[in-house]
Interface confidence: low
């Protein structure tokens, strides 16, 4: 028998520095977790103690904090090289800055293979990107070899900016021939490493013949055997065992997100490459694990540029950006309109001639808007200004909801109107009219939404049974501010870009902004 230790991360999302327990900015070091310096300490400890170790990443290193905003992927290559990752799969967020934003900072700089079997380049890009990412890689580990085959969510064109010269194929269809090829090369230990979410990970384990282990990402799935060490609730045991169509027990793993845990899986193979046993658990990277001093010093050196960036002008406003709670928790506010417009703009994807865009709607809890921005400071808007408006380090995510769920959400928005509560919704691509003289739960008297399957966008009444795409803060997608109906009834949820980054990019693009209050939210006569 031969034993392999797989160490794995996924959905790190730019958390290079240690973070708080909820993966936001670290303040109290005694409570902080994760970060590449701490990760390196634990990885080195395991490398010294165990003979056959692979360190793998299942995608979405890109996007999530000011580190990515400033360094645009160079920080990913630098620190992943420093940690000596063995392989990485491409995630959807790796395409957030277009293909160029992937090629230059990461693909050309990484000293480890970057993988995806279901992304095929065409046209002029095919020669430019050739060899920079691979469908699979055979890695020598001790006296043996292990094949790693990569995959990426086929939804990436809707979630990011891969352009028109990359085709995202069905994962299972694309993986099978690559695994078969590895078998012909006498590689009998094969890991599928990818970024399509836990449901697809399980399907790959079930359907792709020859895959021994699946290491996944995208769905931020936390698996754990026994009592979990922090606040994450396990979606199942670690590893999650799937019985394949040909009768094999295939371990599937994922390690939550944000570098909070290091996945730790021990696999025992027989001489024919069959999995005899698998066990392990994610390791919580808490403050009991010291940060490696050399990596920490490097982090501090790279940080200097971040501090400077915070005070640089992104663009100008020529109007007061009203982000006060007195406005945003009671009525349409122009800060809410600005943020929603930025959220939609960030999700422009012309993927189908029938649709002007795949999504037209935005909702945003007024309580998430924490500060106004005064135009009388020469109109200057900085990252620091935006950090005061959006201080929680969230993301703006894409969900699919039925019209009936949206209706419930808008009823919840005003169910206790007038108490300055955070659930009052700001909107984009939506016209809502409330009648506050009616009973809570029956106050939405008109709800019109902007069409997507149209060449000239216009507002149509919401249909209860229709499925709509909506951009919203991850806080709402997770049921925050009492929006339990969103969490319970959403049909799909894909995590998006860092909230401040979305707004800062929009402001930089527009250069000068002047959002207005324009009648997106109205109150029927006599009630307000």
């Amino acid at each position: 028998a031969w034993e392999l230790t797989i160490l794995h991360t996924n959905d790190v999302h730019s958390r290079l520095e240690q973070t708080s327990e909820d993966s936001s900015k670290c303040v109290n070091a005694s409570r902080c977790m994760g970060g590449v310096a701490r990760l390196f300490t634990k990885v080195q400890q395991i490398r010294r103690a165990e003979p056959n170790v692979l360190l793998l990443d299942a995608g979405d290193q890109y996007q999530g904090t000011i580190w990515f905003t400033v360094y645009k992927g160079a920080e990913v290559a630098h620190f992943m090289n420093a940690l000596r990752y063995d392989a990485m799969a491409l995630g959807n967020h790796e395409f957030d800055n277009g293909v160029e934003g992937l090629i230059e900072p990461l693909l050309k700089e990484a000293k480890f293979p970057i993988l995806s079997a279901n992304i095929k380049a065409k046209g002029p890009l095919a020669s430019q990107i050739s060899g920079l990412y691979l469908p699979y890689k055979v890695l020598p580990v001790g006296d043996e070899v292990v094949g790693i085959v990569g995959y990426t969510s086929k939804e990436t064109p809707f979630l990011s900016n891969p352009g028109t010269n990359l085709v995202f194929e069905d994962e299972i269809t694309a993986l099978q021939p690559e695994v078969d090829k590895l078998k012909t090369l006498n590689v009998n230990k094969i890991i599928a490493l990818g970024h399509s979410g836990f449901e697809m990970d399980k399907l790959i384990a079930q359907k792709v013949r020859g895959v021994d282990v699946v290491v996944g990402g995208h769905s931020n799935t936390f698996l754990y055997t026994g009592n979990p060490p922090s606040k994450e609730v396990p979606a199942g045991k670690y590893p999650f065992i799937v019985t394949s169509d040909d009768g094999r027990k295939v371990p599937v793993v994922q390690a939550y997100a944000f570098g909070k845990y290091l996945g730790y899986l021990k696999i025992e193979f027989d001489e024919r490459g069959n999995v005899i046993s698998s066990h392990g658990n994610p390791i919580l990277l808490n403050s009991s694990i010291p940060e490696d001093p050399s990596i920490k010093a490097d982090i501090n050196k790279w940080r200097i540029k971040l501090d400077n960036y915070s005070t640089q002008e992104l663009g100008k406003t020529i109007v007061y950006l009203d982000g006060s709670s007195q406005s945003c928790r009671f009525r349409e506010c122009n800060m809410g309109n600005l943020i929603c417009d930025a959220m939609i703009n960030n999700n422009l994807r012309h993927t189908d001639e029938m649709f002007w865009n795949h999504v037209s709607m935005c909702i945003l809890n007024g309580g998430g808007i924490r500060s106004p921005i005064d135009e009388r400071n020469n109109g200057t808007i900085t990252w620091e200004n935006l950090a005061a408006v959006l201080p929680f380090g969230g993301t703006f995510d894409l969900v699919q909801l039925k019209g009936s769920t949206l209706k419930k959400a808008f009823e919840h928005s005003v169910h206790r109107y007038g108490q300055s509560t955070g659930e009052f919704l700001q909107v984009g691509g939506i016209h809502v009219v409330y009648d506050l003289s009616r009973k809570p739960g029956d106050r939405v008297v008109k709800l019109d939404v902007l069409c997507t399957k149209c060449r000239v966008p216009s507002y149509d009444p919401l249909k209860m049974d229709e499925v709509y795409k909506v951009i919203l803060p991850n806080f709402l997608a997770n049921g925050g501010d009492g929006f339990q109906m969103i969490k319970d009834e959403l049909l799909r949820h894909d995590s998006g870009d860092q909230d401040i980054n979305v707004v800062s990019t929009y402001i930089s693009k527009m250069k000068v902004i002047y959002p207005a209050v324009e009648g997106r939210i109205k109150f029927s006569t006599g009630s307000h």
Epitope: E21, N28, A29, S30, S230, K231, G368
Partner: antibody
Framework: QVQLVQSGAEVEKPGASVKVSCKAS????????ITWVRQAPGQGLEWMGD????????NYNEKFKTRVTITADKSTSTAYMELSSLRSEDTAVYYC???????????????WGQGTLVTVSS | EIVLTQSPATLSLSPGERATLSCRAS??????????MHWYQQKPGQAPRLLIY???NLESGIPPRFSGSGYGTDFTLTINNIESEDAAYYFC?????????FGQGTKVEIK
């Protein structure tokens, strides 16, 4: 609405232990830190320690570390603070408080229990 | 640990006047644009009540005559147009590092 209801006043002898309870309602108990603060008669506030009920993680003020134990029962949404080896200077009102904010990096105490008077007297 | 020093110890004002309460930390409690300083009001026989969090944010339900400011080590709680119901003890508290500590308090009296 958020409420923290503490157990009633206690009179203990020096050297004994006391266990004060704090029952939480109106919010997700496992998602917010519970802090214990004490106030001796006519004095200021003193941070004793806290617990994250979701994971059982605790932090203690070094001053009390050997004598205080903070626990939480998720099934009843109740936090407990036990102080052992009591002495007369431990006579104080003991408060539990919820750490608030949409982000755990806030740590301000947004809701407080009514306080429990513990008198240590022989 | 970080020591918080409040001044003055007692402040005696007439209704309508402005109260300025100071809290000085022995070490920085601000970082990256955030100030981990909070203010509480406590009336006799009652539990403290949060007024201001993160130096300048007014807690929900607190009258707007209360405001907070400061960055680094020096922080101020201001009460404009003070009213008789504002007579109380006021405490500052930091949450920059463990252990969190409180100031010794300022007593505000209304003449």
């Amino acid at each position: 609405q958020v409420q923290l209801v503490q157990s009633g006043a206690e009179v203990e002898k020096p050297g004994a232990s006391v266990k004060v309870s704090c029952k939480a309602s109106g919010y997700t108990f496992t998602s917010y830190w519970i802090t214990w603060v004490r106030q001796a008669p006519g004095q200021g506030l003193e941070w004793m320690g806290d617990i994250y009920p979701g994971s059982g993680n605790t932090n203690y003020n070094e001053k009390f570390k050997t004598r205080v134990t903070i626990t939480a029962d998720k099934s009843t949404s109740t936090a407990y603070m036990e102080l052992s080896s009591l002495r007369s200077e431990d006579t104080a009102v003991y408060y539990c408080a919820k750490e608030g904010g949409l982000t755990t990096e806030d740590y301000a105490l947004d809701y407080w229990g009514q306080g429990t008077l513990v008198t240590v007297s022989s | 640990e970080i020591v918080l020093t409040q001044s003055p110890a007692t402040l005696s004002l007439s209704p309508g006047e402005r109260a300025t309460l100071s809290c000085r930390a022995s070490k920085q409690v601000s970082t990256s644009g955030y100030s981990y300083m909070h203010w509480y009001q406590q009336k006799p026989g009652q539990a403290p009540r949060l007024l201001i969090y993160l130096a300048s944010n007014l807690e929900s339900g607190i009258p707007p005559r209360f405001s907070g400011s400061g960055y680094g080590t020096d922080f101020t709680l201001t009460i404009n147009n003070i009213e008789s119901e504002d007579a109380a003890y006021y405490f500052c508290q930091h949450s920059r590092e463990l252990p969190f500590t409180f100031g010794q308090g300022t007593k505000v009296e209304i003449k």
